[in-house]
């Protein structure tokens, strides 16, 4: 649970002020563009050559609370006729996001930043070959 | 930058206890999963076939402050033979995911949860063909 | 540089199993599936078996579905294909295929036999 070396310095105070009490800071209510949202997929993940499925984690103690992971359907990828070519790779797109984790001790509430690795969908590749000698 | 309706809940204290002064709320010093990363992509972007280039933005009042953002590099997808196939579509994949914002007036430090959309990679898709009469 | 040890092959009766092991050692990270392809003489390669490191997600050839399991372990970066039900067509040399996403790494290749 230690802090980045770039978190480091972007928690801390400028040099000139008195330095905040250790381990806690203060978090405004809300959240900014909080109304942005991905643009309808347009069934991307069923016409993709590389299609996948979601699953939908949800935890209530966490913002927020349902995260979608990615799938992907095949090892290969769907060629024009709708076969799957095992020549080429069907292969997840990975990001890492923050959370936000609520942890009680009754009626004492704070919260903790989490980094969460997300599948976002996939992606067809060509791989190169290697012979194993 | 109001709380969405999932939101409102998540922030509340449990109903039994005092409520939470209005406005803001203890966040813990410290990343869980810090060290989680996305594994080395070995250029699944240069391989794809649909291809895409990265951009890092920076900002230094943001955790984190530096965001890596995909563009598609063709508007078709790469064949077989290595052209271009523009009968298929290189498509952008979207995730909504959390940033820290770091705002400051003096020696008053607070942050505050903002939602951004990142463009993680691109996918080859088949679109749908519709003749307008 | 990855290496692939592939195990197993040998000469059998219609109707009987075998089951042929692959290890992968040297640099062989972020694994994205482990399977087998076979061939026979003046034939293209054909796809027998994959499993997906991730999940243990699996996909078999029409060919071989319901007498031919893939496992791993994970731990020791292997994967075992146990066929069950030879058939004389199954008579093929048999390549162990490692891929890591853009790179495909193939085994030499272990000699399976069915004879009627």
């Known amino acids: 649970q230690r802090v980045p070396k770039e978190g480091q310095t972007f928690f801390q105070k400028p040099e000139s002020c008195p330095s905040v009490p250790e381990g806690s800071l203060k978090l405004d209510l809300g959240i900014i563009n909080a109304n942005q949202r991905v643009p309808l997929s347009r069934n991307i993940e069923r016409r993709s050559t590389s299609p996948w499925n979601y699953t939908v984690t949800w935890d209530p103690n966490r913002y927020p609370s349902e995260v979608v992971q990615a799938q992907c359907r095949h090892l290969g990828c769907v060629n024009a006729q709708g076969k799957e070519d095992i020549f080429m790779n069907s292969v997840p797109i990975q990001q890492e996001t923050l959370v936000l984790r609520r942890k009680h001790q009754g009626c004492s509430v704070s919260f903790q930043l989490e980094k969460l690795l997300v599948t976002v969908g996939c992606t067809c590749v060509k791989p190169l070959i290697h012979h194993v000698h | 930058q109001r709380v969405p309706k999932e939101g409102q809940t998540f922030f509340q204290k449990p109903e039994s206890c005092p409520s939470v002064p209005e406005g803001s709320l203890k966040l813990d010093l410290g990343i869980i999963n810090a060290n989680q990363r996305v594994p080395l992509s070995r250029n699944i972007e240069r391989r794809s076939t649909s291809p895409w280039n990265y951009t890092v933005t920076w900002d230094p009042n943001r955790y984190p402050s530096e965001v890596v953002q995909a563009q598609c590099r063709h508007l078709g997808c790469v064949n077989a033979q290595g052209k271009e196939d523009i009968f298929m579509n290189s498509v952008p994949i979207q995730q909504e995911t959390l940033v820290l914002r770091r705002k400051h007036q003096g020696c008053s430090v607070s942050f505050q949860l903002e939602k951004l959309l990142v463009t993680v990679g691109c996918t080859c898709v088949k679109p749908l063909i519709h003749h307008v009469h | 540089e990855v290496q692939l040890v592939e195990s197993g092959g040998g000469s059998v009766q219609a109707g009987d199993s075998l089951r042929l092991s692959c290890a992968a050692s040297g640099r062989a990270n972020s694994i994205n599936w482990f399977g087998w392809f076979r061939q026979t003489p003046g034939k293209e390669r054909e796809f027998v078996a994959g499993?997906?490191?991730?999940?243990?997600?699996?996909e078999y050839a029409n060919s071989v579905k319901g007498r031919f399991t893939i496992s791993r372990d994970n731990a020791k970066n292997t994967v075992d294909l146990q066929m069950d039900s030879l058939k004389p067509e199954d008579t093929a040399v048999y390549y162990c295929?490692?891929?890591?996403?853009?790179?495909?790494?193939w085994g030499q290749g272990t000699q399976v036999t069915v004879s009627s």
């Open positions: 499993i997906r490191w991730s999940d243990a997600y699996t």
């Open positions: 295929v490692l891929d890591l996403s853009t790179v495909r790494y």
